[in-house]
């Protein structure tokens, strides 16, 4: 009992502290931290004995999106969708769950993260893990051999996510893919161009796109003496090089995965290299690697890719990185991953990556897995890691203390005197019918000050004020909320004036 009383006192004190910090306009981060502490204290307090024991929360790894977060999300999506459309993509959608059989055998070690559904209808179902496998199923099922499409939807993974770093069990993916038989590397180059366009437009900081090729990796493993059966598991070790040192990776390969130390050293000579087209040229001259058919094909394609990337003006954003070994089993050719760069602490140091924000590659065999005759449809695509981007954009806006509008209301219909509700209702209806985004307060006789305050808080730029005199004169007082400047506008000109002031096209086409 004493413990509960102490906790109640702490909750009260912490609540006062939070209110005080808000009044003092303390930093957003400090307020956020103290609010989080308050919530943790309240959680320990639990419900009153009189209240139910059920803890009201979203499931692990999920979250609600507040209006503010949704506003950020919609802005991000808008940038992405405009880019996808600019590149001529169509849009598709697929079910949120698939037959379990569709997803099995496509993700290698990651298959354990697939959510299976308990279904009474007899079908074994799973929530989709990504948008790529459902896309391949869609192509095979509809016998399509040629499509450029984008798909933005939620996917599900039974991960143990670090939600503070923008990782969840339910999260959005934004995918763009080109399916079809085309000349080498042209669609691949366009995917990289799209990735760069989106990341530049979002202004989330400097980035680098690492590029490699599955065939180069496989060829390199073969000449270094890795047995076929160990390719995938060694790949997953190599892929950790962006997070841990070569020593740690080598220890894992030798200690845990049973690779001979000299084989690991040979791999180390390759995977620690990264550069541009000159590294491709250098490896084409490598006496061992150039003798491997797969690696040679991969290097030839990468050389061509760099030519196209130069023409697209993005070669400075691309790094050929032999340690890139993306985890998914279905990649067959070029693979790439975009990472945001931290500014180096000292000049002369290499930039540090702070996590993947986009990735993709070529997967020429995936559609064939669904075709009874194994007919292949070559595909290449990319996926934008929007959850991480949402987190970064939200943090940036918080740091800048930018106010984000969560509605698009252009005008509030207000009254300066009592008994004008009917007139407000008539006017707001006229505005809605004309395509104007308008609101009114749900009170018969709201105070003018309260109406103006509402506009300030919601970021509404204009107020249309009705008064007795204005009604007689056939005018409406149009007030700018920021400048407080008021002008009388003839009622028949009001729609046009609001559209002019808010930069909206004059006709709803």
């Amino acid at each position: 009992m004493a413990e509960r009383a102490a906790l109640e006192e702490l909750v009260k004190l912490q609540g006062e502290r939070v209110r005080g910090l808000k009044q003092q306009k303390a930093s957003a981060e400090l307020i956020e931290e103290e609010v989080a502490k308050l919530l943790k204290l309240k959680a320990q307090l639990g419900p009153d004995e009189s209240k139910q024991k059920f803890v009201l929360k979203t499931p692990k790894g999920t979250r609600d999106y507040s209006p503010r977060q949704m506003a950020v999300r919609e802005k991000v999506f808008d940038v992405i969708i405009r880019c996808f459309k600019r590149h001529g993509a169509e849009v598709i959608d697929t079910p949120v769950f698939e037959l379990k059989e569709t997803l099995m055998g496509k993700y290698g070690e990651d298959s354990k993260l697939i959510y299976d559904l308990k279904d009474q209808g007899g079908e074994l179902l799973s929530l989709r893990y990504d948008l790529t496998v459902p896309f391949a199923r869609y192509l095979a099922m509809n016998k399509l051999t040629n499509i450029k499409r984008y798909h933005i939807a939620k996917v599900y993974r039974r991960d143990n996510p670090a939600m503070t770093r923008g990782r969840y069990r339910e999260f959005y993916q934004c995918d763009f893919d080109i399916a079809g038989n085309f000349d080498p590397m042209i669609p691949d180059a366009e995917c990289l161009k799209i990735m760069c366009e989106i990341l530049s437009s979002l202004q989330i900081g400097d980035f680098l796109v690492k590029v490699n090729d599955r065939r180069i990796l496989d060829g390199m493993f073969a000449i270094c003496g890795v047995s076929d059966s160990k390719f995938r598991t060694i790949c997953s070790s190599v892929d950790k090089l962006d997070k841990v040192s070569w020593e740690e990776v080598k220890n894992e390969m030798v200690g845990e995965k049973g690779l001979a130390p000299e084989v690991a050293d040979r791999i180390g000579d390759y995977v620690q290299q990264h550069g541009g087209v000159s590294l491709v040229e250098q490896l084409l001259q490598d006496p061992k690697l150039s003798q491997n058919k797969q690696a040679l094909e991969g290097l030839g394609d990468l050389k061509l890719l760099f030519e196209y990337l130069t023409l697209f003006g993005i070669d400075d954003k691309i790094s050929f990185d032999l340690s890139l070994a993306r985890g998914l089993d279905y990649y067959t050719g070029v693979i790439y991953e975009a990472v945001l760069l931290q500014t180096p602490a000292q000049a002369g140091e290499e930039p540090l990556g702070v996590g993947s924000v986009a990735a993709g590659g070529r997967y020429d065999g995936l559609v064939g897995m669904f075709d009874p005759k194994g007919r292949k449809v070559p595909c290449v695509g990319l996926s934008i890691g929007v959850e991480r981007i949402f987190s970064i954009v939200e943090q940036r806006l918080e740091a800048l203390e930018e106010k984000i509008r969560t509605t698009e209301t252009q005008v509030l219909v207000a009254s300066a005197q009592k008994k004008l509700l009917e007139e407000r209702l008539k006017l707001v209806s006229e505005l809605w019918d004309a395509g104007i985004k308008a609101e009114l307060l749900y009170k018969k006789n709201p105070k003018l000050l309260n109406q103006l305050q509402y506009c300030e808080e919601a970021g509404i730029p204009l107020v249309a004020i009705i008064g007795e005199q204005e009604l007689k004169d056939g005018v409406i007082k149009l007030r700018s909320v920021t400048s407080r400047e008021e002008v009388d506008v003839r009622r028949e000109d009001l729609v046009e004036e609001i559209k002019r002031r808010t930069g909206q096209p004059l006709c709803i086409c």
Epitope: A6, L7, E9, L10, L13, R17, K37, K40, L41
Partner: antibody
């Protein structure tokens, strides 16, 4: 019962580095803010740094900012303090401490302390 | 930074005595104050938190009071095991600071 055990202290020359560790047991480590508090020989207590439950927030006292780094590994129930560019005035017993009721900056459980001596 | 000043810096008393130690904050800290006891060669031990709440397992002869800037720790009837150094600490804002300590000695 709640237990905090520090390790990693010792004698180091000025400008040198040490990494202190604190192994926690007997409670759900990942729910608690944790801190390092030090006490110079014969002197009072000084709150050096803290880290939030999920590592989102960290703070350092002015005299160590930029030289010390606090971190934690919830999977290993461990708290760390990386100390670089050590100075004679960093000589102290370093205690690992747990926050009261998970988030209140009052230490309700302390380790036995580990002595760091900075001397040439 | 918030400065914490304890008085007296040392006090001599006998078993059974009533002892009061005071702690003053350089600015208002509401009730964000704790009291600790430390014996030589040992880690501090929490006695009182948020000015007046007794930590579980601490004898009821210890009590705390105050708010704002002035706080007191009272030991109603000194026991032999109470001879130690006592520290106050503010938990209002970082850096969280301690008083310089009050050494309680046997008379």
């Amino acid at each position: 019962q709640v237990q905090l055990v520090e390790s990693g202290g010792g004698l180091v020359k000025p400008g040198g580095s040490l990494r202190l560790s604190c192994a926690a047991s007997g409670f759900t480590f990942s729910d608690y803010y944790m801190s390092w508090i030090r006490q110079a020989p014969g002197k009072g207590l000084e709150w050096v740094s803290y880290i939030s439950d999920k590592s989102r927030y960290t703070k350092y006292t002015d005299s160590v900012r930029g030289r010390f780094t606090i971190s934690r590994d919830n999977a290993k129930n461990s708290l760390y303090l990386q100390m670089n560019s050590l100075r004679a005035e960093d000589t102290a017993v370093y205690y690992c401490a747990r926050y009261l009721y998970q988030v209140i900056a009052i230490a309700d459980a302390w380790g036995q302390g580990t002595l760091v001596t900075v001397s040439s | 930074d918030i400065q914490m000043t304890q008085s007296p810096s040392s006090v001599s008393a006998s078993v059974g005595d009533r002892v009061t130690i005071t702690c003053r904050a350089s600015q208002g800290i509401s009730s964000w104050l704790a009291w600790f006891q430390q014996k030589p060669g040992k880690a501090p031990k929490l006695l009182i938190f948020v000015a007046s709440n007794l930590e579980s397992g601490v004898p009821s002869r210890f009590s705390g009071s105050g708010s704002g800037t002035d706080f007191t720790l009272t030991i109603s009837s000194l026991q032999p095991e109470d001879f130690a150094t006592y520290y106050c600490q503010q938990a209002e804002s970082f850096p969280y600071t301690f008083g310089q300590g009050t050494k309680l000695e046997i008379k």
